[in-house]
């Protein structure tokens, strides 16, 4: 099949890193500097991505693969292939249009990115707050209030009822 395809289209013989020149009898020519072709048989080379500004080069462009970027310190990647860099904030903050702002009471963010999220509502699961939440940490839920009432234990099963006339041994 490949041989038949090659007879039909001479460009299919051009490997990655080259292009099939429309203007020169479809000969395979190497991609020029700052361009690449990642697949064979291409008629044009793609322009290399340039990691400028807040972007920094994680992987250089080659004749067969595009450059890959990440973000300079203080920023993190967003989007497919790190298409954007977003400013980091401290834990306990979120990024707004006006910059990094502390999480409102009742919310937290344990990362340098993303938004402040509400503390877990322990009572929805029938539990109580074991450790209070902060701007940086969610609350820790513990056993339910009923489990903590005097004489009750959530760990040991209740003792069997004693028969009358028997004293404990």
């Amino acid at each position: 099949f490949e041989r038949t395809r090659s007879l039909q289209d001479p460009c299919s013989n051009c490997p990655a890193g080259t292009f099939c020149d429309n203007n020169r009898n479809q000969i395979c020519s190497p991609c020029p500097p700052n361009s690449f072709s990642s697949a064979g048989g291409q008629r044009t080379c793609d322009i290399c991505r340039q990691c400028k500004g807040v972007f920094r080069t994680r992987k250089e462009c080659s004749s067969t693969s595009n450059a890959e970027c990440d973000c300079t310190p203080g920023f993190h990647c967003l989007g497919a292939g790190c298409s954007m860099c977003e400013q980091d904030c401290k834990q306990g903050q979120e990024l707004t249009k006006k910059g990094c702002k502390d999480c409102c009471f009742g919310t937290f963010n344990d990362q340098k990115r993303g938004i402040c999220r509400p503390w877990t509502n322990c009572s929805l699961d029938g539990k109580s707050v074991l450790v209070n939440g902060t701007k940086e940490r969610d609350v820790v839920c513990g056993p339910s209030p009923a489990d903590l009432s005097p004489g009750a234990s959530s760990v040991t099963p209740p003792a069997p009822a004693r028969e009358p006339g028997h004293s404990p041994q």
Epitope: N22, N23, S37, T44, I47, Q50
Partner: antibody, heavy 121, light 112 residues
Framework: SVEESGGRLVTPGTPLTLTCTVS????????MTWVRQAPGKGLEYIGI??????TYYASWAKGRFTISKTSSTTLELKITSPTTEDTAIYFC??????????????????WGPGTLVTVSS | AAVLTQTPSPVSAAVGGTVTISCQAS????????LSWFQKKPGQPPKLLIY???SLASGVPSRFKGSGSGTQFTLTISDLESDDAATYYC????????????FGGGTEVVVK
């Protein structure tokens, strides 16, 4: 040949998609560019698409326009949220790469006749 | 982004005369040569005149001549005809995945 269509009067914020239909060649063989000219202004580069479908935009056009290929002969330009400043004639052109560089060189030829987009409330 | 500055505008000359339009780039174009010239008339699409700084596009009369390299380019129109009245634009190719192309501001040619 190259021909644009889809230009019309739209209100600000209403997305609009322009179409560039080519004949006599395949979009996979060439870079294609979109250029516009606002009334009384000069030519302004919007962006290009490679034969393999990769897109590149002018910095001012990023996020405001989307170039896509819907078939081997049909290219689209979407104006995501038009403003009155986007009122212009929009042109589509092939990059002939007559010097054989293998990528876009600015040898834009042929051009379509253009399609007029008017953004007004 | 690079800037292409065209001078002068407008430029005027008599039929049979010669006009020279300059295109000054703030940064060198790719290969010092990837610069094109276009003719634009009202109601018509641009027309490619010169590519790769000095190569004449197909069907363009040899009265149009492009020259220059790097950051300084010139379009010369000799034996001026009335039909040459138009606005002329240069465009440069840059090694960037954004602002890959930049157009000059245009130069109007008036034929007297």
């Amino acid at each position: 040949s190259v021909e644009e269509s889809g230009g019309r009067l739209v209100t600000p914020g209403t997305p609009l998609t322009l179409t560039c239909t080519v004949s006599g060649f395949s979009l996979s063989d060439y870079y294609m560019t979109w250029v516009r000219q606002a009334p009384g202004k000069g030519l302004e580069y919007i962006g290009i698409m490679s034969g393999s479908g990769s897109t590149y935009y002018a910095s001012w056009a990023k996020g405001r326009f989307t170039i896509s290929k819907t078939s081997s002969t049909t290219l689209e330009l979407k104006i995501t949220s038009p403003t009155t400043e986007d009122t212009a004639i929009y042109f589509c052109a092939r990059d002939g790469d007559y010097a054989g560089w293998g990528y876009a060189t600015g040898a834009f030829d042929p051009w379509g006749p253009g399609t007029l987009v008017t953004v007004s409330s | 982004a690079a800037v292409l500055t065209q001078t002068p505008s407008p430029v005027s000359a008599a039929v049979g005369g010669t006009v020279t339009i300059s295109c000054q780039a703030s940064q060198s174009v790719v290969g010092n040569s990837l610069l094109s010239w276009f003719q634009k008339k009202p109601g018509q699409p641009p027309k490619l005149l010169i590519y790769s700084a000095s190569s004449l596009a197909s069907g363009v009369p040899s009265r149009f001549k492009g020259s220059g390299s790097g950051t300084q380019f010139t379009l010369t129109i000799s034996d001026l005809e009335s039909d040459d009245a138009a606005t002329y634009y240069c465009t440069g190719r840059y090694n960037s995945d954004t602002d890959t192309f930049v157009f000059g501001g245009g130069t109007e040619v008036v034929v007297k």
